[in-house]
């Protein structure tokens, strides 16, 4: 089984410039327990929550989110309404975090290109960032040193070979689209920025968070590329300055125990198996 991936696609309808839709999907074998969509940065790192979606409880959303919904069992969409005369969404980063079992939490971000001209020239490659939760870094300087060394090695190696192509995607030709992909390995995309960090936050799949049926079955389309609502093959317009962060660790507070799937759940638990999470959200 390959490393899970999260894709993010931001669309602005050509007919309605104040209407945006964020599409996100999870490609992996795990069971999705929660999806958080934020803007202005990753959730918990300067970003502001726009919506939280649970596969059975439903969805919570906050302005300017208009409608959050599941498109498939492993992808969601969030419609946004821009009431302002100017369009603040155009320069905004949107992030989607998928909490899955047993992989942990994976997040990816993307944004619209600054120009609204559909005929943009070839864009730069998104920058992959391995993001670390601060609490997980403490006391793990050794891991960080190793990571920095590895990243430097990658940087050096990338200079001596061409930038690989992004994975092909399907986008709506009627929309301006930005897509950010979380590659299976960091080396699959060019590392242009020196400030990447290594994620050290991990929530192990302990016995009390184990899936009742063992490993979850593969999502029906996990092996395929994501497909937009009205998809037609075209070259995606990638956001300038968009980035991807791959985070393999469920987001728990330091010192918080992984809750059990039975009674006595910890409030607002972020690190838990699907049964414990499968039962609370409703689309609002």
């Amino acid at each position: 089984a390959g490393t899970p991936e999260v894709w993010v696609q931001v669309q602005m309808e050509a007919t309605e410039l104040s209407s945006f839709t964020v599409h996100c999907g999870f490609l992996g074998p795990g069971s999705i327990s929660l999806v958080t969509v934020s803007w202005g940065g990753p959730d918990g790192a300067g970003g502001t929550k726009l919506a939280v979606l649970h596969p059975e409880l439903g969805t919570r959303q906050w302005a300017p989110a208009r409608q959050a919904r599941w498109e498939t069992q492993s992808s969601i969409s969030l419609a946004l309404e821009d009431s302002g005369a100017s369009s603040p969404f155009a320069n905004t980063t949107f992030c989607c975090k998928f909490a899955s079992f047993p992989e942990g939490s994976w997040e990816s971000c993307g944004s619209l290109p600054p120009s609204s001209d559909p005929g943009l020239s070839a864009p730069p490659t998104p920058v992959p960032i391995l993001r670390a939760d601060l609490a997980g870094i403490l006391g793990l300087s050794g891991v960080l040193l190793f990571g920095c060394g590895y990243l430097l090695h990658l940087l050096r190696r990338q200079k001596h070979r061409p930038t690989p192509r992004l994975q092909p995607s399907h986008t709506n030709s009627q929309a301006l689209t930005a897509q950010a992909w979380a590659p299976s390995q960091a080396s699959q995309a060019a590392l242009h920025d020196p400030y990447a960090t290594i994620n050290t936050s991990f929530c192990p799949a302990t016995l009390d968070t184990a899936h009742p049926n063992g490993w979850a079955s593969l999502p029906t389309h996990a092996a395929h590329q994501p497909q937009g609502p009205a998809a037609s093959a075209s070259t995606p317009i990638l956001a300038r300055g968009s980035f991807v962060s791959v985070e393999n660790g469920l987001y728990t507070q330091a010192g918080e125990r992984p809750p059990h799937t039975g009674p006595g759940l910890t409030l607002f638990p972020d690190c838990r198996g699907p049964r414990a999470l499968e039962g609370r959200f409703g689309v609002r």
Epitope: K49, L57, S75, L265, G282
Partner: antibody
Framework: EVQLVQSGAEVKKPGSSVKVSCKAS????????IEWVRQAPGQGLEWIGE????????NYNEKFKGRVTFTADESTSTAYMELSSLRSEDTAVYYC???????WGQGTLVTVSS | DIVMTQSPDSLAVSLGERATINCKSS????????????LAWYQQKPGQPPKLLIY???TRESGVPDRFSGSGSGTDFTLTISSLQAEDVAVYYC?????????FGQGTKLEIK
Amino acid sequence: EVQLVQSGAEVKKPGSSVKVSCKASGGTFSSFSIEWVRQAPGQGLEWIGEILPGSNSTNYNEKFKGRVTFTADESTSTAYMELSSLRSEDTAVYYCSSYWFAYWGQGTLVTVSS
Amino acid sequence: DIVMTQSPDSLAVSLGERATINCKSSQSLLNSGNQKNYLAWYQQKPGQPPKLLIYGASTRESGVPDRFSGSGSGTDFTLTISSLQAEDVAVYYCQNAHSYPPTFGQGTKLEIK
């Protein structure tokens, strides 16, 4: 174990305001919405609205818009609901709840009487 | 707003017998994307807050006895208590968890015959 503890019962005059508090413990306060639901004597449950403590983003039931205000204090993990221009039909038990109505406070009885 | 209508308003069942409560929504609570129904059931005993029993129309909350089960799809849902116990005497509510605002049924009072 998550707990939501609400402030005590209140008796108010028509036209006045009431502010009910809801203190959360046992989890990450800013992760999920705090919901407010009320129940008039012998009646059903009515959603008033919600607040997301981290960003103070809110959603209100149209019926209560303009009369209700939600606030949250992350430093004390406490959410507040203030209802103004009280009338007799606002007499009810007011509940705070979280995580998609999985956790509930014990309720606060607000009596509006002249 | 989605209107939730429960039937019957009250129900008297003998101990050990089956109790069935119905809930009808004015709009479908089925999300076509992931084929999930966003409906929840709550139990409320006198002087207590409601307690979540069932979510996703049929998934039992942790710690809820298996005599409680939920079924249905779209607009028609059912809560079944397979063998009524004395402690099950309460008011039961269904709730639209599909779209804003969350709305509740008027409640069904369950008593022992």
